[in-house]
Amino acid sequence: IPLSRTVRCTCISISNQPVNPRSLEKLEIIPPSQFCPHVEIIATMKKKGEKRCLNPESKAIKNLLKAVSKERSKRSP
């Protein structure tokens, strides 16, 4: 993986752009660790499998996280 030799953070830039939950393949939340001091949110898009880093402080992204967790809780018994 590029850059992994020097640092373990994943995100080089972050995005505030709202993401349509329907276009999401996967959403990963990586908590801060000894390797990377900040929380990272990585969205994998259905289109071409693009991965996009999202801004955890953005209102739109916070709303996305709420929507995704609500969807998950609906699915689980």
Epitope: V7, C9, I12, S13, I14, P37, I42, E50, K51
Partner: antibody
Framework: QVQLVESGGGVVQPGRSLRLSCTAS????????MHWVRQAPGKGLEWVAV????????SYADSVKGRFTISRDNSKNTLYLQMNSLRAEDTAVYYC?????????????????WGQGTTVTVSS | EIVLTQSPGTLSLSPGERATLSCRAS???????LAWYQQKPGQAPRLLIY???SRATGIPDRFSGSGSGTDFTLTISRLEPEDFAVYYC??????????FGPGTKVDIK
């Protein structure tokens, strides 16, 4: 509008130091990784260094490793390149460039905004 | 270290013609890591394509990118007068971490 403006270039003797600055406006600087890319007279593009949005990720081309240091001050919307032990082969136009929104180690969105460059000449 | 080779070095064409520019990597490159740039004399480069085939914001649809593995292509379907420039491919992911090809100059025949 979205803009990057480089400054700090000039004529310097071999072995001396120089610090370049790049001031950003028109976008949220603290969200974007930033690069320095250089172009020697009549030559192609050469990537120099990258710094992540939070300053944690830093990486350098082999040709400048140990001599150049990339840094940023998000409160001042400014990117820096500290260049020490300068050599004649460092003579070039130095561009700062913005990393695309959301870029990460798995998917690269390219350098989507560039400054107009500042000229560094290393000569005795 | 992955080395990028671009061919031809110079492409002489007329406005309206189709331009096909090649970028070859010395080892396989993920298409997620391949970009193309345009540079005109005295100007900064401009991002055209990222992810091997996705057009950057504001880039006309006459520009398209394709390819995978070691072979990538930038195609300009119909050359406009403003398209005569130098084109660079770039890969991300090995040491040095961002590598540019030597460029292809598209000039007027």
């Amino acid at each position: 509008q979205v803009q990057l403006v480089e400054s700090g270039g000039g004529v310097v003797q071999p072995g001396r130091s120089l610090r370049l600055s790049c001031t950003a406006s028109g976008f949220t600087f603290s969200k974007h990784g930033m690069h320095w890319v250089r172009q020697a007279p009549g030559k192609g593009l050469e990537w120099v260094a990258v710094i992540g949005f939070a300053g944690v990720i830093k990486s350098y081309a082999d040709s400048v490793k140990g001599r150049f240091t990339i840094s940023r001050d998000n409160s001042k919307n400014t990117l820096y390149l500290q260049m020490n032990s300068l050599r004649a082969e460092d003579t070039a136009v130095y561009y700062c460039a913005r990393e695309g929104e959301g870029s990460n180690i798995y998917f690269y969105y390219g350098m989507d905004v560039w400054g107009q460059g500042t000229t560094v000449t290393v000569s005795s | 270290e992955i080395v990028l080779t671009q061919s031809p070095g110079t492409l002489s064409l007329s406005p309206g013609e189709r331009a096909t520019l090649s970028c070859r990597a010395s080892q396989s490159v993920s298409s997620s890591y391949l970009a193309w740039y345009q540079q005109k004399p005295g100007q900064a480069p401009r991002l055209l394509i990222y992810g091997a085939s996705s057009r950057a914001t504001g880039i006309p649809d006459r520009f398209s990118g394709s390819g995978s593995g070691t072979d990538f292509t930038l195609t300009i379907s119909r050359l406009e007068p403003e398209d005569f420039a130098v084109y660079y491919c770039q890969q991300y992911g090995s040491s040095p971490i961002f590598t540019f090809g030597p460029g292809t100059k598209v000039d007027i025949k």
